[in-house]
């Protein structure tokens, strides 16, 4: 038997993926465990193999269909179970009744690009990936810019309280290398959290013209 505190957290990407992390103090690293998904109003089930991500935590992705298919709705409830093999039997280690649209975490924004850059400002655009059409425009974004000599953690957060897939960065220093990241969050869902940060976009402001300040 496995003792110790257990934590089982899952998020729905709003389309066809449920990502889960299970942590268990004192669990054996070589134990074979799975996540089983049983929707209440669907005829399908799904399983994924939990793989170790640290000393006492495992993760897996339940692939429900193609990335752009709408496999669950706000009225679905999915029973999620962690099952671990003990000899020839499977033992249930954790269970939750999962409401997908209360536990959202979207994919990181993609296709970041510089639309226009000047000496002191830069216009950047991006796209959201695999986000349900249910949200319509009910999304918000956070963005941050990495300046020379600073860390990402020190970068001030800029909040966009609407579905706006572009930003104009201002008061930048001429001829300077910057990096930019953005993340997205639906307004819906009690336990909804921010997406991962996008891949950083590197850009350089234009040099100041000679003879001008």
């Amino acid at each position: 038997a496995v003792n110790g505190t257990s934590r089982f957290t899952c998020f729905y990407n709003s389309r066809a993926n449920i990502s889960c992390v299970w942590s268990q103090d004192g669990a054996l690293q070589d134990t074979s465990c799975q996540v089983h998904a049983w929707p209440d109003r669907r005829r399908w089930n799904q399983t994924c193999e939990l793989l170790p991500v640290s000393q006492a935590s495992w993760a897996c992705n339940l692939i429900l269909g193609t990335p752009d298919s709408q496999k669950l709705t706000a009225v679905d409830i999915v029973t999620l179970r962690v099952m671990c093999r003990e000899g020839v039997r499977w033992r249930m280690m954790a269970i939750q009744d999962f409401k997908p649209f209360e536990n959202l975490r979207l994919m990181a924004p993609i296709s970041l690009q510089v639309v226009h850059v000047e000496t002191h400002r830069c216009n950047i655009s991006w796209k959201i990936s695999q986000a349900s059409h249910y949200f319509e425009r009910h999304l918000e974004f956070e963005a941050r810019t990495l300046s020379p000599g600073h860390t990402w953690e020190e970068a001030p957060l800029m909040t966009l309280k609407q579905k706006q897939e572009w930003i104009c960065l201002e008061t930048l220093t001429p001829d300077t290398q910057y990096e930019f990241q953005v993340r997205v969050k639906p307004l819906q869902g009690e336990f909804t959290t921010w997406s991962p940060w996008s891949q950083p976009l590197a850009f350089r402001t234009k040099p100041a013209a000679l003879g001008k300040d």
């Epitope: 399908w44 193609t66 990335p67 752009d68 709408q70 669950l72």
Partner: nanobody, 116 residues
């Protein structure tokens, strides 16, 4: 409503091949993704392969590299080419369609039996 009709199942030797077909009729304009699921002795209906309207695909781990899903939108048909079949592929194979609204539609199923 969407109706789905599968065909192509049967008995095959291990290592052999089969091609399943599924024809959709009815409100086909509402269909987004189409997929094949299978239900074996454990009674779980799990994803085998899925394909979106624009051709993105997803496969279950146990069939990757052996099964190929394809779709002919003009014919409202989805196919599952199954190669290097194994006895553990024995199951009832169901065609599935999901709508933009998140509804699921199912065929009646076709039996695939792989003998060793």
């Amino acid at each position: 409503q969407v109706q789905l009709q599968e065909s192509g199942g049967g008995l095959v030797q291990a290592g052999g091949s089969l091609r399943l077909s599924c024809v959709a009729s009815g409100s086909v304009s509402s269909i987004n993704g189409m997929a094949w699921y299978r239900q074996g002795a454990d009674n779980q209906r799990v994803l085998v392969a899925a394909i979106s309207r624009v051709g993105n695909t997803a496969y279950g781990d146990s069939v990757k590299g052996r099964f190929t899903i394809s779709r002919q939108n003009a014919r409202n048909t989805v196919y599952l080419q199954m190669n290097s079949l194994k006895p553990e592929d024995t199951a009832v194979y169901y065609c599935n369609a999901d709508s933009w609204g998140g509804d699921d539609y199912w065929g009646q199923g076709t039996q695939v039996t792989v003998s060793s």
